[in-house]
Interface confidence: low
């Protein structure tokens, strides 16, 4: 168990011409917030695949309003760290995705509007318990500076937070800097002493005397930036033309570790630290079983025919893929009505409505009935961008303000006489006809072609139409 921590130092326009002056649109002030997403391994995963190691959302930053003619500043950022707790082992290799979101605070129908401003993706190797790693990334015209680290919690130790130390109930007999560690009940374990001179900032060790380098650093003491000239290398023969030391082949050159394993040099050889689900000298053996928890997003893992076998994931609604790693594109169902723009934010769907529409799915037409009243008991019907009134009987017109003569359309058939009534109209039928509109002839024998008139109602009596 442990926590991944991300500290955003600055976000602003990158160097060079064409850099944006402001993150806000012309509609007014805005504020920024960040989303961090962690995915296991070093894979080129699809952007929409879930954050299997976890995700976190920052608070909203201070409101920013563009100052005309002022130099474009680094933008005001939310306070505090972004923290992503992890429950299982820290995988060592991971993909880090940082998204910068803009929240527009202008007069938006249906609340503030969100839009993704920048997204950076880094595939990294990182040991838990190491120092902060710093990074600068460009995303389009924006530049993001940040630091990150993984640290163990809840008595876990080691670069993967897999070894558990438990405090003794009895007072410790060990000196300062030593920690009691299970299962060594009566002994104490010192944090390993790294190779002399191993960079405190860029190196770490699990075993005494070793010096493993963090991403971007190299050399036996992790003091050489990986991108610098090989003249600073410390291995291999000298080159007569440059006076440089030309690096000779090292055990980890070409990374012999397969499947995203990380390589560390041992005297005359190498050692692979394999990601979960792989083992073997070079992490070449794919041994993923249900015990490894390969099904993401609550998928049900079904094993094969024996404990050593592969697995099949049965995915819950909303997810697909062999590991339930892909979220079904809920926007493909077009849930936003009236031309609204669908945004799948992961935790929820959001519809950005066109002007004149509102509601969770843009189902309300604000132009239709807002502030419009239908007179004389009429009801307003939305649709088509213009309101329409459904009028009570006896009224008509756009707003039901006009009196309507229910008898004007001559509704009584076969010479029946029409009378206007408070609740509609009444037809007085001519002899030989019956029905609410005098539509049914009465046969000479007194039996109609349809079922007989109700008791007490004789043909020719007026029948009120309700």
């Amino acid at each position: 168990a442990g926590v991944f921590e991300l500290q955003i130092h600055s976000f602003g326009p990158g160097p060079g011409p064409g850099a944006p002056r402001s993150p806000c649109s012309a509609r007014g002030p805005c504020r920024l917030f960040f989303r961090v997403c962690l995915k296991p391994g070093l894979s080129e995963e699809a952007a929409e695949s879930p954050c299997a190691l976890g995700a976190a959302l920052s608070a909203r930053g201070p409101v920013y309003t563009e100052q005309p003619e002022a130099p474009a500043p680094d933008l005001p950022l939310p306070n505090g760290l972004l923290q992503v707790p992890f429950r299982d082992a820290w995988p060592g290799t991971f993909s880090l995705i940082i998204e910068t979101w803009r929240e527009e605070l202008g007069d938006q129908i249906g609340g503030p509007a969100w839009s993704l401003l920048a997204r950076v993706t880094r595939r990294r190797r990182l040991a838990a318990g190491g120092p902060w790693a710093r990074d600068i990334q460009r995303a389009g015209a924006w530049e993001l500076r940040f630091s990150y680290r993984a640290r163990c919690e809840l008595l876990a130790v080691g670069t993967a937070c897999t070894r558990l130390c438990r405090p003794r109930s009895a007072p410790s007999r060990c000196g300062p800097g030593l920690r009691p560690c299970a299962p060594l009940e009566d002994e104490c374990e010192a944090p390993p002493v790294c190779r002399a001179g191993c960079s405190l900032e860029h190196g770490f060790c699990e075993q005494p005397g070793e010096c493993r380098c963090l991403e971007g650093w190299t050399g036996p003491l992790c003091t050489v930036p990986a991108s610098t000239s090989s003249c600073l290398g410390l291995r291999g023969p000298s080159s007569a033309t440059t006076g440089c030391l030309v690096p000779g082949p090292g055990p980890c050159d070409g990374n012999p570790c397969a499947n995203g394993g990380s390589c560390s040099e041992t005297p005359g050889s190498f050692e692979c630290t394999c990601p979960r689900g792989f083992y073997g000298l070079r992490c070449e053996v794919s041994g993923v079983t249900c015990a490894d928890g390969p099904c993401f997003n609550g998928g049900l893992c079904v094993g094969g025919a024996d404990p050593d076998s592969a697995y099949i994931c049965h995915c819950p609604p909303g997810f697909q893929g062999s590991n339930c790693e892909k979220r079904v594109d809920r926007c493909s169902l077009q849930p936003c009505r009236n031309g609204g723009l669908c945004l799948d934010l992961g935790h929820a769907l959001r519809c950005r409505c066109r002007a004149g529409f509102a509601g969770p799915r843009c189902e309300h037409n604000l132009d239709d009935c807002a502030g419009r009243a239908c007179a004389n008991g009429g009801t307003c019907v939305e649709g088509g961008g213009a309101h329409r009134c459904s009028c009570a009987l006896g009224f008509g017109g756009r707003d039901c303000r006009e009196r309507a003569d229910p008898c004007a359309a001559r509704p009584c058939a076969h010479g029946g006489r029409c009378y206007a009534h408070f609740s509609g109209l009444v037809c007085a039928c001519a002899p030989g006809y019956m029905g609410s509109r005098c539509e049914f002839p009465v046969h000479p024998d007194g039996v109609s072609a349809l079922p007989a008139a109700p008791p007490g109602l004789r043909p020719g009596d007026p029948q009120r139409y309700l």
Epitope: L42, G260, V285, V288, P294, S322
Partner: nanobody, 117 residues
Framework: QVQLVESGGGSVQAGGSLRLSCAAS???????MAWYRQAPGKERELVSR???????NYAASVKGRFTISQDNAKNTVYLQMNSLNPGDTGMYYC????????????WGNGILVTVSS
């Protein structure tokens, strides 16, 4: 696009043998290939699997009778099935597991194996 083409299925008497082949194409970063089977009315189950390095495992019911092998140059995996019995009847599916994190499974269309007594 990953494609798997199975061949070699058919009908055989109990005690007989068959050799299934599965040719794969259109992928990178192969981790392992496998044969699964599904008997009528039953769940699909793993029969055997082989990793790129040659590591194999088998279902308990086929150990000693079935042998999985591969030809990496031809991107093909084989399942040699000996001492077949009626319980081995079913659809046999080839599967390939690929990707840097071995998280993507692709399946063939399946091939029918029928063992009569």
């Amino acid at each position: 696009q990953v494609q798997l083409v199975e061949s070699g299925g058919g009908s055989v008497q109990a005690g007989g043998s068959l050799r299934l082949s599965c040719a794969a194409s259109g992928y990178t970063d192969r981790c392992s290939m496998a044969w699964y089977r599904q008997a009528p009315g039953k769940e699909r189950e793993l029969v055997s699997r082989i990793s790129t390095s040659g590591f194999t495992n088998y279902a308990a019911s086929v150990k000693g009778r079935f042998t999985i092998s591969q030809d990496n140059a031809k991107n093909t995996v084989y399942l040699q099935m000996n001492s077949l019995n009626p319980g081995d009847t079913g659809m046999y599916y080839c599967a390939i597991i690929v990707g840097r994190t071995c998280s993507l499974n692709y399946w063939g269309n399946g091939i029918l194996v029928t063992v009569s007594s």
